[in-house]
Amino acid sequence: QPSVSPGEPSPPSIHPGKSDLIVRVGDEIRLLCTDPGFVKWTFEILDETNENKQNEWITEKAEATNTGKYTCTNKHGLSNSIYVFVRDPAKLFLVDRSLYGKEDNDTLVRCPLTDPEVTNYSLKGCQGKPLPKDLRFIPDPKAGIMIKSVKRAYHRLCLHCSVDQEGKSVLSEKFILKVRPAFKAVPVVSVSKASYLLREGEEFTVTCTIKDVSSSVYSTWKRENSQTKLQEKYNSWHHGDFNYERQATLTISSARVNDSGVFMCYANNTFGSANVTTTLEVVDKGFINIFPMINTTVFVNDGENVDLIVEYEAFPKPEHQQWIYMNRTFTDKWEDYPKSENESNIRYVSELHLTRLKGTEGGTYTFLVSNSDVNAAIAFNVYVNTKPEILTYDRLVNGMLQCVAAGFPEPTIDWYFCPGTEQRCSASVLPVDVQTLNSSGPPFGKLVVQSSIDSSAFKHNGTVECKAYNDVGKTSAYFNFAFKGNNKEQIHPHT
């Protein structure tokens, strides 16, 4: 019993004056607490507690369940304890079969003994199975058996407390260990779609999937730059041990333009946090934006191919697309396809393939597209470059030589005189008159140019060359002169 110097408060004294007491089942337990400032007796075993305000604790017929720690406390808060074992051969263990352990921590199998004199107090696997090789434990007859550093692999381990009594092994009722996993990584979070585009009034619904080892992972939807609590619904599943999945679904039943923004799904556990975002854009109505992938003014050489290509954004999805030329709709030669196979794709491509274009096929080619909200169009002006063609070369009644040529771009006509019969003409002759004839005609056809020179300027036999040329090529026509005396004869035009 404790001894202290006079004047200082001292703990109560207990009779019998020993730390442990063994009584047989059915016998009397009589404990006396002596202290001038006695307050109470407290009894504890497992999670059970009982109190007694009388200084003598008497249990007339002891039962195994009376095994436990009896503590006497005085008014100074000082206490003294005695542990009583009630030996019952039919009930060697008191048990609370609740058995939970946190990974990497110790956990107590609560099977205190009613008889401290039995031997080989230990743990055994159920149905004769061995315990895991790395399982370490420390027995304590007054508390139970402490499993050290619980492993995840011990989850659902079935075991018994065991003692040897008179040479025989006696087992307690079975315990099943449930292991709470330690978080050793951040949660895994993913979102159903990275971006959403909606019209006003449509429903916005997005699901965040959170995966972790246990359900105690925390998760929430947040709106960036806002503290407003969002309404979310949960579904969750345990896919076997330590494989937990939660789906947190955020819904805005009728989205408005000012709901646009970035929404974050945030999850954390004791190891750390993770997040994923999705972007919502709400528009008051649908739209179509067209982007030409080549210049809308196109120059192409006669007989060559050209592809007219547009990209366009359409929301909602495009419903009708067409390419038109001269009020005529193309039924083939074009294709229209989404820019990506992504579910949230709003970008598309349309291509019109024009092959072996003729000079007569220049003009305006128009792409039209529509959805349920809007129509849009874009026009391409296609010019076909053609080598000049000499349409007429004549000597007029007034003695003028006239050359008419057509082509695109607009041909230039030059005149040359070749003395004798040479056809390599070098001396240039200035025209008297040059006119572009078809300025009132179709804007994309060939351009016709007329040029005239005065034949009276030529005094010798020879050849006059009319040469029409542009960026694409050149063409010539010739006039032959023959003089008899003072008279000009036989003006033979030829190309």
């Epitope: 507690t49 609740s98 659902r156 709470r180």
Partner: nanobody, 123 residues
Framework: EVQLLESGGGLVQPGGSLRLSCAAS????????MSWVRQAPGKGLEWVSA????????YYADSVKGRFTISRDNSKNTLYLQMNSLRAEDTAVYYC????????????????RGQGTLVTVSS
């Protein structure tokens, strides 16, 4: 075969009371601390209350403290939950279960759990 059979659920107005019972068969409940847990529509399991093997120690979730009382009668192998001052947010299926994790977490299993009884709090 172990069975835990809950009863006593039903429709009650806010502010009203109910007493849930859980009768065990094929199992001696005195060998277990016992718990009540609940699951509200669309939510996960939530631990409500627990009681030690002999009944002298009781534990409650903050959301029910002062309104719910857990008790047991080991001689009848029965667990009880007295629910007073009920609120709409108490609407759930209530389950009795063997075991209690003294760290206050429910994390993936009881040795045994009943089929549940539905409590609906609505005006």
């Amino acid at each position: 075969e172990v069975q835990l059979l809950e009863s006593g659920g039903g429709l009650v107005q806010p502010g009203g009371s109910l007493r849930l019972s859980c009768a065990a068969s094929g199992l001696t409940i005195s060998t277990y601390a016992m718990s009540w847990v609940r699951q509200a529509p669309g939510k996960g399991l939530e631990w409500v209350s627990a009681i030690s093997t002999g009944g002298s120690s009781t534990y409650y979730a903050d959301s029910v403290k002062g309104r719910f009382t857990i008790s047991r009668d080991n001689s009848k192998n029965t667990l009880y939950l007295q629910m007073n001052s009920l609120r709409a947010e108490d609407t759930a299926v209530y389950y009795c279960a063997t075991g209690y994790d003294s760290s206050g977490h429910y994390y993936g299993g009881f040795d045994y759990r009943g089929q549940g009884t539905l409590v609906t709090v609505s005006s």
